[in-house]
Interface confidence: low
């Protein structure tokens, strides 16, 4: 009405979806009696009576607000519960006396969207596309009002850029009145974007202020042509025979081209294709010196049929040849001398060592070992080790057995064995010499012989303990072309209950096992007893 005072701006009340809005009627006592008020909702300039206050008592009007309204604060405030987006409108209270006045409240409703869901284009993007292609889609569900989306690449916001970056956003209204925002990022990507991290950010407002939510970061498969192929060898550094060596063909394109690896034939100088898998990996396992040579890789793009060649790479598989020792099977008399010579070839400088096989003691650093005034004890194994000091683990060895002519030599001359009558004994006897001796026993039983090394033999005998055996004892005799030698095993009766625990006999290199004759599959290891005091 002309001349009437301009309506004041409505009071702003901000609430989140699902919470309770408190609509305080701001009429002063002079403007109206709060015990007699009508409340209206205004939608599209149409007023609808929703609540009456009479004598301080409230009554909802039938309709959409009927179940959600109640009076608070002695009638001055109308509480609206379970606020929905549809409640975003103007509410007004109208006092009836002394004259009709009204007070307007603008209700603003907010709802944070769910965490943004980002989906990358799984098929990837070629770098040479003529126009921006779909990189990823960002969906923010159930927000109110519509959130704003910002796309980021490597932490920097993306702006619309003609023919480069296009952001296509749309929104749908759910039945709840909430908005779901979908934003599609389209971009022209370059090769450097293969590792780029993309994410989207939703900006939205709540009564508490401005907020934002970020999606996870994603990378998009980027397809770009190969410009260069090259070879990579693993492991890096010096290679040696026996290593697992992988020669890998690599390319700077995606998808990689079809690879083939060739090696130059040293005699024809022609490149010959090696058998690789489709990943372009040539596995040399175990690597041999023959694998050394000049390798190159060819990458063939099966779409364009463009072929690229790598720089050739020299591969050196370091080796030590078989070690040769001369003489190969030396035989010497006691008191004589012997010179052992070791030879080997290698791709690198070699170091030689001579070791005593039985003890591991280093006897000589160098290819020649000289042994003087040989004794029987000098017989046995000598090992030459040829190694490359610059490449740990690269070595070859050769064992040579030095035979000192001599008659059999017994591991023990005499031995006492405690037994019980009717037990089955397991006796052993060891002898060495050159030529290697054979062993015989003076009693009947089951004997077996094992060659321990070229000069040493071990014989085992299973025998039943009888009174006659106790009387005679047991002898083992070793013989070769140069003589005979005997070991004697004295058998002594003992009661098994007097055996001391954990006192296994380990005298010499022989063992004896007693078992009841009646239980052939049961054995009990012989125990060593303290000497009786009466024994001298």
């Amino acid at each position: 009405v002309p001349g009437e005072a301009e309506q004041p701006a409505p009071e702003l009340v901000e609430v989140e979806v699902g919470s309770t809005a408190l609509l305080k009627c701001g009429l002063s006592q002079s403007q109206g009696n709060l015990s007699h008020v009508d409340w209206f909702s205004v939608h599209k300039e149409k007023r609808t009576l929703i609540f009456r206050v009479r004598q301080g008592q409230g009554q909802s009007e039938p309709g959409e607000y009927e179940q959600r309204l109640s009076l608070q604060d002695r009638g001055a405030t109308l509480a609206l519960t379970q606020v929905t987006p549809q409640d975003e409108r103007i509410f007004l209270c109208q006092g009836k006396r002394p004259r009709s006045q009204e007070y307007r409240i603008q209700l603003r409703v907010y709802k944070a969207p769910e965490e943004p869901n980002i989906q990358v284009n799984p098929l990837g993007i070629p770098v040479n596309s003529k126009e921006p292609e779909e990189v990823a889609t960002c969906v923010g569900r159930n927000g109110y009002p519509i959130p704003q989306v910002i796309w980021y690449k490597n932490g920097r916001p993306l702006k619309e850029e003609k023919n480069r970056v296009h952001i296509q956003s749309s929104q749908t209204v759910e039945s709840s009145g909430l908005y779901t925002l979908q934003s599609i990022l389209k971009a022209q990507l370059v090769k450097e974007d293969k590792d780029a991290q993309f994410y989207c950010e939703l900006n939205y407002r709540l009564p508490s202020g401005n907020h934002m939510k970020e999606s996870r970061e994603v990378t998009v498969p980027v397809f770009y042509p190969t410009e260069k192929v090259w070879l990579e060898v693993e492991p890096v550094g010096m290679l040696k025979e026996g290593d697992r060596v992988e020669i890998r063909c690599l390319a700077d394109g995606n998808p990689p081209p079809h690879f083939s690896i060739s090696k130059q034939n040293p005699s024809t100088r022609e490149a010959e294709e090696e058998t690789t898998n489709d990943n372009g990996v040539l596995v040399l396992e175990p690597a041999r010196k023959e694998h050394s040579g000049r390798y190159e890789c060819q990458g063939l793009d099966l779409d364009t049929m463009i072929s690229l060649l790598s720089e050739p790479q020299e591969l050196l598989v370091n080796y030590v040849s078989d070690v040769r020792v001369s003489p190969a099977a030396p035989e010497r008399q006691e008191g004589s001398s012997l010179t052992l010579t070791c030879e080997a070839e290698s791709s690198q400088d070699l170091e030689f060592q001579w070791l005593r096989e039985e003890t591991g003691q280093v006897l000589e650093r160098g290819p020649v070992l000289q042994l003087h005034d040989l004794k029987r004890e000098a017989g046995g194994g000598y090992r030459c080790v040829a190694s490359v000091p610059s490449i740990p683990g690269l070595n070859r060895t050769q064992l040579v057995n030095v035979a000192i002519f001599g008659p059999p030599w017994m591991a023990f001359k005499e031995r006492k064995v405690w037994v019980k009558e009717n037990m089955v004994l397991n006796l052993s006897c060891e002898a060495s010499g050159h030529p290697r001796p054979t062993i015989s026993w003076n009693v009947n039983g089951t004997a077996s012989e094992q060659d321990q090394d070229p000069q040493r033999v071990l014989s085992t005998l299973n025998v039943l303990v009888t009174p006659e055996l106790l009387e005679t004892g047991v002898e083992c005799t070793a013989s070769n072309d140069l003589g005979k030698n005997t070991s004697i095993l004295f058998l002594e009766l003992v009661n098994l209950t007097t055996l001391t625990p954990d006192s296994n006999t380990t005298t010499g290199l022989s063992t004896s096992t007693a078992s009841p004759h009646t239980r052939a599959n049961s054995t009990s290891t012989e125990r060593k007893l303290p000497e009786p005091e009466s024994r001298g």
């Epitope: 799984p122 098929l123 990837g124 489709d278 099966l302 779409d303 049929m305």
Partner: antibody
Framework: EVQLVESGGSLVQPGGSLRLSCEAS????????MSWVRQAPGKGLEWVSI????????SYADSVKGRFTISRDSSKNMLYLQMNSLRAEDTAVYYC????????????WGQGTLVTVSS | FMLTQDPAVSVALGQTVRITCQGD??????ASWYQQKPGQSPVLVIY???NRPSGIPDRFSGSSSGNTASLTITGAQAEDEADYYC?????????????FGTGTKLTVL
């Protein structure tokens, strides 16, 4: 929208020939390798052949090598399979499928076309 | 070269089921998995390490160990009843060759 539509399937006598076609749309045809895959009635899938995006490189399953020829015409967005010396065991639904080497084997398939070899 | 699958597998509605595929080539390549319903073309459901094309529900997942690939459906639905095929590239030769598994018929009870 990516679409692959096969045609050319029919009833043919053993020893006869047939040419299948596959019309592609909705993507840059020459950027993708294409394959033919077949499925005999009531049986599983069997890969038949592949051709590179340029058409310069092809490969075949042992069962069809020497009898079938795969080709393409990128100007027409067409893929072909020339089938000669047909046998009863070639009876199948033939699918064309989009293939991307080293990334995504068969991401889109046609609806298939039925080839029946019978006397 | 061959890829071997169980001919038939059944699962109760809402339960988890795993379909396996075995073959030497799976030591070098990941399997791709396809779903085929009667009278329809196959549909790619899993490829690469464990990737789903858009439109494939997240109840489908893939995994691989040694020479065995697996397709897992967590919370199987009635609409998942179909034939499932694995597929891999040959790892032995230089020419690209592909092979499909023998197929597994999935029944949702």
């Amino acid at each position: 929208e990516v679409q692959l539509v096969e045609s050319g399937g029919s009833l043919v006598q053993p020893g006869g020939s047939l040419r299948l076609s596959c019309e592609a749309s909705g993507f840059t045809f020459s950027s993708y390798a294409m394959s033919w895959v077949r499925q005999a009635p009531g049986k599983g899938l069997e890969w038949v052949s592949i051709i590179s995006g340029s058409g310069g490189s092809t490969s075949y399953a042992d069962s069809v090598k020497g009898r079938f020829t795969i080709s393409r015409d990128s100007s027409k967005n067409m893929l072909y399979l020339q089938m000669n010396s047909l046998r009863a065991e070639d009876t199948a639904v033939y699918y064309c499928a989009r293939d991307k080497y080293g990334y995504n084997p068969f991401d889109y398939w046609g609806q298939g076309t039925l080839v029946t070899v019978s006397s | 070269f061959m890829l071997t699958q169980d001919p038939a597998v059944s699962v109760a509605l809402g339960q988890t089921v795993r379909i396996t595929c075995q073959g030497d080539s799976l030591r070098s390549y990941y399997a791709s998995w396809y779903q085929q319903k009667p009278g329809q073309s196959p549909v790619l459901v899993i490829y690469g390490k464990n990737n789903r094309p858009s439109g494939i529900p997240d109840r489908f997942s893939g995994s691989s160990s040694g020479n065995t690939a697996s397709l897992t459906i967590t919370g199987a639905q009635a609409e998942d009843e179909a034939d499932y095929y694995c597929n891999s590239r040959d790892s032995s030769g230089n020419h690209p060759l592909y092979v499909f598994g023998t197929g597994t018929k999935l029944t949702v009870l």
